[in-house]
Interface confidence: medium
């Protein structure tokens, strides 16, 4: 039968004052010689030689410092042998516990932790969790870490709290404002012995990035703008509208979208945003007509590309800016409108018979021009004559068989209207279908003066072809689009300047 005792030993200190730390004895020693042997970790396995036994008395001594963090306890395997080396008892397991001392500081898993949190987050929102360990005995005061924020930069007012037990960092309030501070740095101390004065400590840094939300309403630099634009012109840079937004630059929370509230029902204008500068460029994409509209009021609003944050939804009121547009009259003078007309000449029409009228319209009045003279331009087979004052077209002579054959039954000539004051010439195209010469060619005795377009339909108000390529370098506050100042003249292409 074994008789035994074992005391605990304390790590990191001289335990020899407790020797013998353990003692074993077999009652077989009453009638024979017994040799005691021990083995195990701390004896014949690393760390070697911590425990030694007096083979005769069974006293076990400890020889050096022990580390609980290496071996929290020792199991000493004990044997009682007779003189032949045979076991007298079943081997005994003797357990020696190592008592913990606070010889390990807390260790943070990182020297610097990184976290992020949206501005305006509610109080008590989790930002990050710090991780620290202590190698001392688990579930013991020596390894119980208490966390504490010891410094915050910027230090204006404390914005974060830490759970002393879990290391969770949360928002203290809902006042985080990226536009004020985009980042916070915290210094956190972890102290074992649950933060007691006798504990060991370690520190770490926490870098907390404040993420932007769309909590700033964009606004235009000016509440009203005044511009002038020439009629009949396009302009790709009529007005620059700068938008101010305090949210994170170049993010969707900052990028503006300017839109029309009213006044652009005719879709004359577009606003194109420059996403690098948050400037809106007002463009004329459809020409204005002074005769139809001398001025107009545009009302514009601004919002962001991103939705507004819920925290400002209730504050958002659509705030309009006004653009007063003055349309400048351009002396447009006479033009042929339509620029091409088709007539019919029958076989029974003769010299001085009327083919039709081709009159230039004064675009400034919308009525037939009274300031032009008409002359024939290209006149194949010298077929027609024009009245220089009225624009009346007549046959010079009855159409001959030779003329008919030469023209293939189709005439295409031009008429010119010349305004000597404006030094402007306008060209109209005359198309004539010459009816074939047959037995019944005298049946149509009336001169055919029905005017049709070159599609064969009745006269239409087919509009002029506009040149839509425009450039402008004008960026003054009152905008003008006179030709040569960045705007393109859009009078019809059958108008020519010069004598």
């Amino acid at each position: 039968e074994w008789i035994k005792f074992a005391a605990a030993c304390r790590e990191g200190e001289d335990n020899s004052k407790r020797n013998p730390i353990a003692k074993i004895h077999s009652d077989c020693a009453a009638n024979q010689q017994v040799t005691y042997r021990i083995s195990g970790v701390g004896i014949d396995q690393p760390p070697y030689g911590i425990f030694v036994i007096n083979q005769k008395t069974g006293e076990i001594n400890i020889t050096s410092i022990v580390d609980r963090e290496v071996t929290p306890f020792f199991i000493i395997y004990c044997r009682a042998l007779n003189s032949m080396g045979q076991d007298l008892e079943r081997p005994l397991e003797l357990r020696v516990r190592v008592l913990d001392i606070n010889d390990n500081p807390p260790v943070f898993s990182m020297a610097t932790f990184a976290g992020q949190i949206e501005e305006n987050s509610n109080a008590n929102t989790l930002v990050m969790i710090l991780n620290a360990t202590d190698a001392d005995e688990p579930n013991n005061l020596n390894s119980k870490i208490a966390f504490k924020i010891i410094r915050q930069e910027p230090s204006d007012s404390p914005m974060f709290i830490i759970n002393r037990n879990t290391g969770e960092i949360r928002t203290m309030n809902n006042f985080l404002d990226r536009e004020q501070y985009g980042q916070y740095a915290l210094a956190v101390r972890g102290s074992d012995r649950d933060g007691g004065a006798d504990g060991m400590s370690a520190e770490c840094e926490c870098n907390i990035k404040i993420l932007d939300v769309n909590d700033n309403i964009p606004y235009m630099e000016q509440s009203s703008y005044t511009i002038e634009i020439q009629e009949n012109t396009l302009n790709s840079n009529l007005l620059e509208i700068r938008v101010i937004d305090l949210d994170e630059e170049f993010s969707a929370n900052w990028m503006a979208v300017i839109f029309f509230i009213s006044g652009n029902e005719g879709n004359w204008f577009e606003i194109e945003m420059n996403e690098r500068t948050n400037v809106g460029i007002l463009k004329v994409v459809k020409p204005l007509d002074y005769e139809a509209m001398q001025s107009l009021q545009l009302s514009i609003g601004v919002r962001n590309k991103a939705e507004f944050h819920h925290s400002i939804m209730s504050q958002y009121k659509l705030k309009a800016s006004a653009i007063s547009v003055t349309v400048l009259n351009v002396i447009e003078g006479p033009v042929f409108r339509p620029g091409s007309k088709t007539y019919v000449v029958t076989g029974n029409m003769g010299s001085n018979d009327k083919v039709g009228d081709f009159v230039a319209t004064d675009l400034d009045t919308g009525r037939p021009s009274t300031t032009v003279r008409y002359v024939m331009g290209n006149n194949p087979a010298d077929l027609l004559a024009v009245d220089s004052r009225t624009g009346k077209l007549t046959l010079k002579n009855k159409v001959t068989k030779e003329q008919y054959n030469m023209l293939g039954g189709k005439y295409q000539g031009t008429i010119l209207s010349i305004d000597d004051n404006l030094q402007r010439t306008c060209t109209g195209t005359i198309n004539i279908n010459i009816q074939s010469f047959g037995n019944d060619d005298r049946t149509n005795t009336e001169p055919n003066t029905k005017i049709t377009t070159n599609t064969g339909r009745q006269e239409s108000t087919s509009s002029t072809n506009y040149d839509t390529s425009t450039t402008s370098t004008d960026s003054s506050q009152v905008y003008s689009s006179e030709p040569g100042n960045g705007a393109k003249d859009l009078l019809s292409d059958n108008v020519h300047f010069g004598p």
């Epitope: 335990n15 020899s16 911590i50 020889t63 050096s64 963090e69 190698a135």
Partner: antibody
């Protein structure tokens, strides 16, 4: 289980600096051991260079002390040796080892031994 | 020149008993534990004896050691061919730090 692996740049020129690193895998360098460098010139015996504890405490061989630096890098779980002003006499196989070093209590001697060794790396010093 | 003195070589035939000596002074062997290492060809050393005379688990009982004053000795009985290796004694010196013997080459004939 814990393993040690020496690594270094290879040959070193005379008067140059020998630099070696020992990586500790399968365990923490912050455990309560002394991390040791031992060398063995070709065909000769073992020579203790020095040892370091994870807190930076060192014991160095007095005959090499002026030329030796041993450092520990806890974040990478490794320790290093720097030996300056080398000569051909510093050509050797360099071993890193895990040491136990315990001062004995009253009446008991000191424990000092190595229970785990790296494979060793040969460093030649030649021009 | 090693601090601890060992014979450069010893030899023996299989089954024989050989002894390797290690002598020093009071500052190391005289006051601290002696350790013995075995280094098989081309490998790192491994511990053979700790605390003067104790065998680690796994070391055959053919190996034994003792210490007396400032000298120590390692005995190998029942010699086998796999015992052919270099053997080193080592101890801590309170002034010089760790010291090794010069090593003894054991040849099994």
């Amino acid at each position: 289980q814990v393993q040690l692996q020496e690594s270094g740049p290879g040959p070193v020129k005379p008067s140059g600096t020998l630099s070696l690193t020992c990586g500790v895998s399968g365990g923490s360098i912050s455990s309560n051991h002394w991390w040791t460098w031992v060398r063995q010139p070709p065909g000769k015996g073992l020579e203790w260079i020095g040892e370091i504890y994870h807190n930076g405490s060192t014991f160095l061989n007095p005959s090499l002390k002026s030329r030796v630096t041993i450092s520990v890098d806890k974040s990478n779980n490794q320790f290093s040796l720097k030996l300056t002003s080398v000569t051909a006499a510093d050509t050797a196989v360099y071993y890193c080892a895990r040491g136990w070093h315990r001062t004995g209590f009253r009446g008991y001697p000191s424990h000092w031994y190595f229970d785990l060794w790296g494979r060793g790396t040969l460093v030649s010093v030649s021009s | 020149q090693s601090v601890l003195t060992q014979p450069p070589s010893v030899s023996g035939t299989p089954g024989q008993r050989v002894t390797i000596s290690c002598s020093g002074s009071s500052s190391h062997i005289g006051s601290n534990y002696v350790y013995w290492y075995q280094q098989l060809p081309g490998t790192a050393p491994k511990i053979l004896i700790y605390s003067n005379d104790q065998r680690p688990a796994g070391v055959p009982d053919r190996f034994s050691a003792s210490k007396s004053g400032t000298s120590a000795s390692l005995a190998i009985s029942g010699l086998r061919s796999e015992d052919e290796a270099d053997y080193y004694c080592a101890a801590w010196d309170d002034g010089q730090g760790g010291v090794f013997g010069g090593g003894t080459k054991l040849t099994v004939l």
